[in-house]
Interface confidence: low
C-alpha cells in the first residue's frame, strides 16, 4: 500500500469510557494533528476510515458497523457506541485518505466497569473550588453532543454513594451543582448521572469528578519567608558544616508557579566555585497552601565563605520577596596559654 503519514499511537489521549453507556469519540486527527477540519476534508473528497486492534491482539481489523441496533456507528468524524461493551477495549485508528493523500492516528480506548458507588479505574478530573468564596459551580462534564437540545434529560447528582438532596451547602441545579460556600468537608468525588431517551431506548451517562477545596485568592498573600530571619545567626568556625534552611510559605494561587532560590554574593549557587548543595522539600496544607524548604549546605565552610552574603528569594503570582541569612565567623574562645604569654609580655 502507498505511504501514509502515521502519527502513531496517541497515548496522550487515553480515552476511558464506562461499560454499557453511550460513547462518542472524535477522530483526533482533526483536533490535534491536521490544520483542517472534517468538513473541509470531506468536501475535498477525502474519506475517513476506522479500524481497530483488539486488546492483546496484533491484528488490525475493520470495525463492524452492521451490529444489531447500530451499536457502533460513524457520524462525520465521530465514532459512536450505543452502548459500549467491555470487549470494545483496544486501539482504534482513524485514517483520512484519497488516492494521493493519507494520514492516520491510533488511540487507546478503555472500557471500564464501575460499581454501585461509581468507583472505577477511571482517571478523574479534578475541579478546584476556593474555600468560603461565594457561590461556585461545577458542571457535568463531557455530555455535549449526546442528545439534541430538544431532549430534556434527567440529571441526578451524587457525592460518593449518596444522592445529593437536602445537603446544607450543595444544591443540584440540572447540569450544574452549586456550592453555596465551599468548605473542606466538600472535598470528595461527585457524580452526575444523565438519563436520556433515544429511539425508544434509555441511555445513561455517568461522569465523576473530584472536588478539591483550595485556599481562596481573597486570603492570598505574597510568599512569606519564615527562615532565614533576624532571630537566628549562623555562627560557624572554618571547617564546620554550614546549613541554612530557607522555609517559605505560599498561599494557594490557581496556576501560580512557586519558586524558591538562593543567591550567594548575588549569584546563583551554580555560577560560583564553592562546593554548595541545595536540597528541597515541599509540603502542602489541606487547602493546598505550600511550604517549601531549601537547605543550603556547605560541607566545610571557609572563613571566606563566612563573609559572603546568603540570600533566600521566593516568588509567586502575588509577588517576590527576599531575606538574607545572618552568617558570621565564630570568634574562638581565648586560649589560656596565649593569654598568659600576653600577660607576661605586658609586665
Amino acid at each position: 500500500s502507498e505511504r501514509c503519514d502515521d502519527w502513531g499511537l496517541d497515548t496522550m489521549r487515553q480515552i476511558q469510557v464506562f461499560e454499557d453507556e453511550p460513547a462518542r469519540i472524535k477522530c483526533p486527527l482533526f483536533e490535534h494533528f491536521l490544520k483542517f477540519n472534517y468538513s473541509t476534508a470531506h468536501s475535498a473528497g477525502l474519506t475517513l476510515i476506522w479500524y481497530w486492534t483488539r486488546q492483546d491482539r496484533d491484528l488490525e481489523e475493520p470495525i463492524n458497523f452492521r451490529l444489531p441496533e447500530n451499536r457502533i456507528s460513524k457520524e462525520k468524524d465521530v465514532l459512536w457506541f450505543r452502548p459500549t461493551l467491555l470487549n470494545d477495549t483496544g486501539n482504534y485508528t482513524c485514517m483520512l485518505r484519497n488516492t494521493t493523500y493519507c494520514s492516520k492516528v491510533a488511540f487507546p480506548l478503555e472500557v471500564v466497569q464501575k460499581d454501585s458507588c461509581f468507583n472505577s479505574p477511571m482517571k478523574l478530573p479534578v475541579h478546584k473550588l476556593y474555600i468560603e468564596y461565594g457561590i461556585q459551580r461545577i458542571t457535568c462534564p463531557n455530555v455535549d453532543g449526546y442528545f439534541p437540545s430538544s431532549v430534556k434529560p434527567t440529571i441526578t447528582w451524587y457525592m460518593g454513594c449518596y444522592k445529593i438532596q437536602n445537603f446544607n451547602n450543595v444544591i443540584p441545579e440540572g447540569m450544574n451543582l452549586s456550592f453555596l460556600i465551599a468548605l473542606i468537608s466538600n472535598n470528595g468525588n461527585y457524580t452526575c448521572v444523565v438519563t436520556y431517551p433515544e429511539n425508544g431506548r434509555t441511555f445513561h451517562l455517568t461522569r465523576t469528578l473530584t472536588v478539591k477545596v483550595v485556599g481562596s485568592p481573597k486570603n492570598a498573600v505574597p510568599p512569606v519567608i519564615h527562615s532565614p530571619n533576624d532571630h537566628v545567626v549562623y555562627e560557624k568556625e572554618p571547617g564546620e558544616e554550614l546549613l541554612i534552611p530557607c522555609t517559605v510559605y505560599f498561599s494557594f494561587l490557581m496556576d501560580s508557579r512557586n519558586e524558591v532560590w538562593w543567591t550567594i554574593d548575588g549569584k546563583k549557587p551554580d555560577d560560583i566555585t564553592i562546593d554548595v548543595t541545595i536540597n528541597e522539600s515541599i509540603s502542602h496544607s489541606r487547602t493546598e497552601d505550600e511550604t517549601r524548604t531549601q537547605i543550603l549546605s556547605i560541607k566545610k565552610v571557609t572563613s571566606e565563605d563566612l563573609k559572603r552574603s546568603y540570600v533566600c528569594h521566593a516568588r509567586s503570582a502575588k509577588g517576590e520577596v527576599a531575606k538574607a541569612a545572618k552568617v558570621k565567623q565564630k570568634v574562638p574562645a581565648p586560649r589560656y596559654t596565649v593569654e598568659l604569654a600576653c600577660g607576661f609580655g605586658a609586665t
Epitope: 468560603e132 468564596y133 461565594g134 457561590i135 492570598a220
Partner: antibody, heavy 120, light 108 residues
C-alpha cells in the same frame, strides 16, 4: 424580585457617626458576598468595603479604621457603620451584591444609593 | 494596592460610531476585570466581567478584551442609550475593588 435598598443617609456634622443599612430582598444575604461603594458628587466610583459569606471583611486603605461593615443574615440586612465623619466622606453610598460565580467578584446588582452629606 | 488608569477621560462620538475605552492596571490582574456603565442619577450597571464575559441581558455590541495589565471596552456601534460614563474595576484577589476614574461618552 431581587433588589437592594439603602437607607440611613442624611446631613451630619463632621466628627459624628452614622449607620447605613441595606435591606436585601429576593435572595439570602447568607449566600452572597456584599460590598459598599461610594461616589462623591461629580466624581468617580470608590470601593469602600466588602463582607464575604463567612463574615470575613475587607476595606479600602483610606477609611483607616473609621468604617465597619457588618450584616445580620436573619434580617437580610447589610450595614456600614461610619465614625469620625469628615467633609470628604460626603457621597452617595451604594450597596452592591457580588456576582458569586466563576471566582470573578464583579458587582452584579446595585441599590439606588443613599446620600450622606457631612457639613457644619 | 492596584491602581487603575482609564483613558480617555471623556470622548465625543456619534450614533453608529465604534468606541474604544482602555484601562491599564498598575500590576497584572490576570483577567480579574469588570466594566460598568453609569447614567446620571442612576446606579452603575455591570456590562462585562472576567475581562471579556458579557453579563446576561447586556447587548452584544459591548465587548471586552485584554488580560494582565491592559484591557479594552469596545462598543461596536454606539446607540443613543449608550451615552453614559464607563468605569473599569479590578477584581483581583485582596486588592480588588479599585475603580478607574471613568470615561464619559458624550454626543458629538
Amino acid at each position: 424580585e431581587v433588589q437592594l435598598e439603602e437607607s440611613g443617609g442624611r446631613l451630619v456634622q463632621p466628627g459624628t457617626s452614622l449607620r447605613l443599612s441595606c435591606a436585601v430582598s429576593g435572595f439570602s444575604l447568607s449566600s452572597y458576598d456584599m460590598s459598599w461603594v461610594r461616589q462623591a458628587p461629580g466624581k468617580g466610583l470608590e470601593w469602600v468595603s466588602t463582607i464575604y459569606i463567612g463574615g470575613t471583611t475587607a476595606y479600602a486603605s483610606w477609611p483607616k479604621g473609621r468604617f465597619t461593615i457588618s450584616k445580620t443574615n436573619s434580617k437580610n440586612t447589610l450595614y456600614l457603620q461610619m465614625n469620625s465623619l469628615r467633609a470628604e466622606d460626603t457621597a452617595v453610598y451604594f450597596c452592591a451584591r457580588l456576582q458569586g460565580a466563576n471566582y470573578y467578584n464583579s458587582l452584579a446588582l446595585w441599590g439606588q444609593g443613599t446620600l450622606v452629606t457631612v457639613s457644619s | 494596592d492596584v491602581q487603575m488608569t482609564q483613558s480617555p477621560s471623556s470622548l465625543s462620538a456619534s450614533v453608529g460610531d465604534r468606541v474604544t475605552i482602555t484601562c491599564q492596571a498598575s500590576q497584572s490582574i490576570y483577567s480579574f476585570l469588570s466594566w460598568y456603565q453609569q447614567k446620571p442619577g442612576q446606579a452603575p450597571k455591570l456590562l462585562i466581567y472576567a475581562a471579556s464575559d458579557l453579563e446576561s441581558g447586556v447587548p452584544s455590541r459591548f465587548s471586552g478584551s485584554g488580560s494582565g495589565t491592559d484591557f479594552t471596552l469596545t462598543i461596536s456601534s454606539l446607540q443613543p442609550e449608550d451615552f453614559a460614563t464607563y468605569y473599569c474595576q479590578s477584581n483581583y484577589i485582596i486588592d480588588y475593588g479599585a475603580f478607574g476614574q471613568g470615561t464619559k461618552v458624550v454626543i458629538k
